[in-house]
């Protein structure tokens, strides 16, 4: 089947990095500068991606593969193939429309990206809070109150400071 296809369609012989040039009797012509073809038998070459602004070039475009971008310092990639660059925030913050905002009480973010998430609810596993949570760190759960020896004690987190809707641990 492959042989009959190549007899019928001379373009199928054009390798990656070339295109089948209809204007030149279906000759395999090399991709022009700033374009590529990653598979054989293509009738056109694709324009190389350009990494501009907050994007920087991670891998240069070649005749057979597209350029790859990442983000300049202070930004990180989002989406397939780094289609967007999103601003970094500090630990203990999350990105909103207005920029980086501190995590609300009862939530934390230990990374420079992503959203603030709630402290672990220790009581779900029958445990108690050993170390209180902060904006940057989750709570540390310890043994359940029943497991503690008479002299030991566990830390109880402060009551939510009027932050709406937080379910205290």
């Amino acid at each position: 089947f492959e042989r009959t296809r190549s007899l019928q369609d001379p373009c199928s012989n054009c390798p990656a990095g070339t295109f089948c040039d209809n204007n030149r009797n279906q000759i395999c012509s090399p991709c022009p500068p700033n374009s590529f073809s990653s598979a054989g038998g293509q009738r056109t070459c694709d324009i190389c991606r350009q990494c501009k602004g907050v994007f920087r070039t991670r891998k240069e475009c070649s005749s057979t593969s597209n350029a790859e971008c990442d983000c300049t310092p202070g930004f990180h990639c989002l989406g397939a193939g780094c289609s967007m660059c999103e601003q970094d925030c500090k630990q203990g913050q999350e990105l909103t429309k207005k920029g980086c905002k501190d995590c609300c009480f009862g939530t934390f973010n230990d990374q420079k990206r992503g959203i603030c998430r709630p402290w672990t609810n220790c009581s779900l596993d029958g445990k108690s809070v050993l170390v209180n949570g902060t904006k940057e760190r989750d709570v540390v759960c310890g043994p359940s109150p029943a497991d503690l020896s008479p002299g030991a004690s566990s830390v109880t987190p402060p009551a939510p400071a009027r932050e709406p809707g937080h379910s205290p641990q």
């Epitope: 999103e86 990105l95 609300c104 009862g106 998430r117 672990t120 379910s167």
Partner: antibody
Framework: QVQLQQSGAELAKPGTSVKLSCKAS????????IYWVKQRPGQGLEWIGN????????FYGEKFMGKATFTADTSSSTAYMLLGSLTPEDSAYYFC??????????????WGQGVLVTVSS | QVVLTQPKSVSTSLKSTVKLSCKLN????????VHWYQQHAGRSPTTMIY?????PDGVPDRFSGSIDSSSNSAFLTINNVQTEDDAIYFC??????????FGGGTKLTVL
């Protein structure tokens, strides 16, 4: 592809409880908030609360504290909402929805199909 | 407490342009993103506009979103209105990043 599949309609008597489920597929369940939203027939949308399945941390709207309880089973990628002490006021559609991990004020990108809870004696 | 106010109902004619409003009662409309959902009867909401003015894949470019800080409002504009646009439209924003707020919804009737 991402899907949120909710359990079937519920008919309950006043004073009883119902447990609604929301089974997630097509993404990492522990890395996104699941929100629960109430809609009475012909009315608007009302935030009940949300859960971070990764650690079971929860938030509740003031109106729903003591009414709703959220849990999540990571082994089956399912979020649950228990509605207690039911009254006719709890008769509504209940939706679960996912919020992307993009920004703190982001939209709900996927919704469950909704489940109708009817409270009647 | 943050409230988003939408007109209860709006009527428009086929192929016309309609602009639905969502007014924030306190604070600044620019503080948090505004999102718009469409809901047909008996269905779950679907996103029409997110992050003020972005359109998800598959949503016709007849739909657009905007913010007007002078009126402290967000707007959903639908050009060349079609019969399938007959639905309820909800706006959605935040009071704090853990407290989402919805508008009451606008029932759009296409005549």
């Amino acid at each position: 592809q991402v899907q949120l599949q909710q359990s079937g309609a519920e008919l309950a008597k006043p004073g009883t409880s119902v447990k609604l489920s929301c089974k997630a597929s097509g993404y990492t369940f522990t890395s996104y908030y699941i929100y629960w939203v109430k809609q009475r027939p012909g009315q608007g949308l009302e935030w009940i609360g949300n859960i971070w399945p990764g650690n079971g941390g929860t938030f509740y709207g003031e109106k729903f504290m003591g009414k709703a309880t959220f849990t999540a089973d990571t082994s089956s990628s399912t979020a649950y909402m228990l509605l207690g002490s039911l009254t006719p006021e709890d008769s509504a559609y209940y939706f679960c929805a996912r919020r992307p991990d993009y920004s703190g004020d982001d939209y709900f990108d996927y919704w469950g199909q909704g489940v109708l809870v009817t409270v009647s004696s | 407490q943050v409230v988003l106010t939408q007109p209860k109902s709006v009527s428009t004619s086929l192929k016309s342009t309609v602009k639905l409003s969502c007014k924030l009662n306190s604070g600044n409309i620019g503080s948090y993103y505004v999102h718009w959902y469409q809901q047909h009867a008996g269905r779950s909401p679907t996103t029409m506009i997110y992050r003020d003015d972005k359109r998800p894949d598959g949503v016709p470019d007849r739909f657009s979103g905007s913010i007007d800080s002078s009126s402290n409002s967000a707007f959903l504009t639908i050009n060349n209105v079609q019969t399938e646009d007959d639905a309820i439209y909800f706006c959605h924003s935040y009071d704090s990043t853990i407290t989402p707020v919805f508008g009451g919804g606008t029932k759009l009737t296409v005549l």
